[in-house]
Amino acid sequence: NKILVKQSPMLVAYDNAVNLSCKYSYNLFSREFRASLHKGLDSAVEVCVVYGNYSQQLQVYSKTGFNCDGKLGNESVTFYLQNLYVNQTDIYFCKIEVMYPPPYLDNEKSNGTIIHVKGKHLCPSPLFPGPSKP
């Protein structure tokens, strides 16, 4: 049995920050779990981790240099990413693992969210508003 994950297809970080909500078909209350956010189609970069344990405070960390925070809901984890750069525009996938109580559960691969970062260029390039709605 796999947990299903829902994400917005696209989010825009106009101020170099974005809230990405991962909604699960599973209630995380009183569970030990590891929710993570991954960058790239191959999910090669683990952006942020939210570790929850019913007996401890929520742990949020990034081992890849992202400025992130996390908030827990009953059936969701929201990742708050700050100080994003234009070159971090990519597709981001939510992942969830439930370690306790048994059985171990993880998720079906989600559709992913494209985070489009506008502003804070690492090197200057001309800005263009993009196509308007047809």
Partner: antibody
Framework: EVQLEESGGGLVQPGGSLRLSCAAS????????MSWFRQAPGKGLEWVSV???????NHADSVKGRFTTSKHNSKNTVYLQMNSLRSEDTAVYYC???????????????????WGQGTTVTVSS | EIVLTQSPATLSLSPGERATLSCRAS??????LAWYQQKPGQAPRLLIY???NRATGIPARFSGSGSGTDFTLTISSLEPEDFAIYYC?????????FGQGTKVEIK
């Protein structure tokens, strides 16, 4: 006028390399999402790669490790470097722009709204 | 990877007739489906996006409907320039995938 023009296709032996170019006019590739697609003779369309506005790239599993996508913002051009070519890579290659629309709360790309005319790549000995 | 199945493979109709093309997804793509027209030797052209919205400059005789897994492209009255191959494409998840196409030919 908004348009894309591919070049660089040709006949190459298996194991060989080619670099395709996609020159944009009427808009800037630096702030758009650009994809490469291909269409084998008599077949449907297959996504090959995407390069996002900030330069991050993703490739289809079928070309991963062999093809590399890049762009030159000042030349307003996107490239597809194809190495270790195989006979199954024979196709017409198109570049296309992802049309993007909406506001902060409802922002998405809606489809490929600008396409180039395509360039033919034939891999044969 | 989401598989899109189009039917019929070929549709033989006369100018002025109504064309109904179907696209079925292997799993729900919500309304994130586009339709393209392709003529021989030409690039695809975006007709419909998000299942039912006409792209810029597309005539009103083209309309799209559906959500979830079943979608329809309707051409209300075929014009001579409408005879072509039509592809559906999903953007619900990556990679974006296309159907195998429906050829609309002159009867």
């Amino acid at each position: 006028e908004v348009q894309l023009e591919e070049s660089g296709g040709g006949l190459v032996q298996p194991g060989g390399s080619l670099r395709l170019s996609c020159a944009a006019s009427g808009f800037t590739v630096s702030s758009n999402f650009m994809s490469w697609f291909r269409q084998a003779p008599g077949k449907g369309l297959e996504w090959v790669s995407v390069i996002y506005s900030g330069g991050s790239i993703n490739h289809a599993d079928s070309v991963k490790g062999r093809f590399t996508t890049s762009k030159h913002n000042s030349k307003n051009t996107v490239y597809l470097q194809m190495n270790s070519l195989r006979s199954e890579d024979t196709a017409v290659y198109y570049c296309a722009r992802h049309g993007i629309t909406g506001t902060t709360g409802d922002y998405h790309y809606y489809g490929m709204d600008v396409w180039g005319q395509g360039t033919t790549v034939t891999v044969s000995s | 990877e989401i598989v899109l199945t189009q039917s019929p493979a070929t549709l033989s109709l006369s100018p002025g007739e109504r064309a109904t093309l179907s696209c079925r997804a292997s799993q729900s793509v919500s309304s994130y489906l586009a339709w393209y027209q392709q003529k021989p030797g030409q690039a695809p052209r975006l007709l419909i996006y998000d299942a039912s919205n006409r792209a810029t400059g597309i005539p009103a005789r083209f309309s799209g409907s559906g959500s979830g897994t079943d979608f329809t492209l309707t051409i209300s009255s075929l014009e001579p320039e409408d005879f072509a191959i039509y592809y559906c494409q999903q953007r619900s998840n990556w990679p974006p995938t296309f159907g195998q196409g429906t050829k609309v030919e002159i009867k």
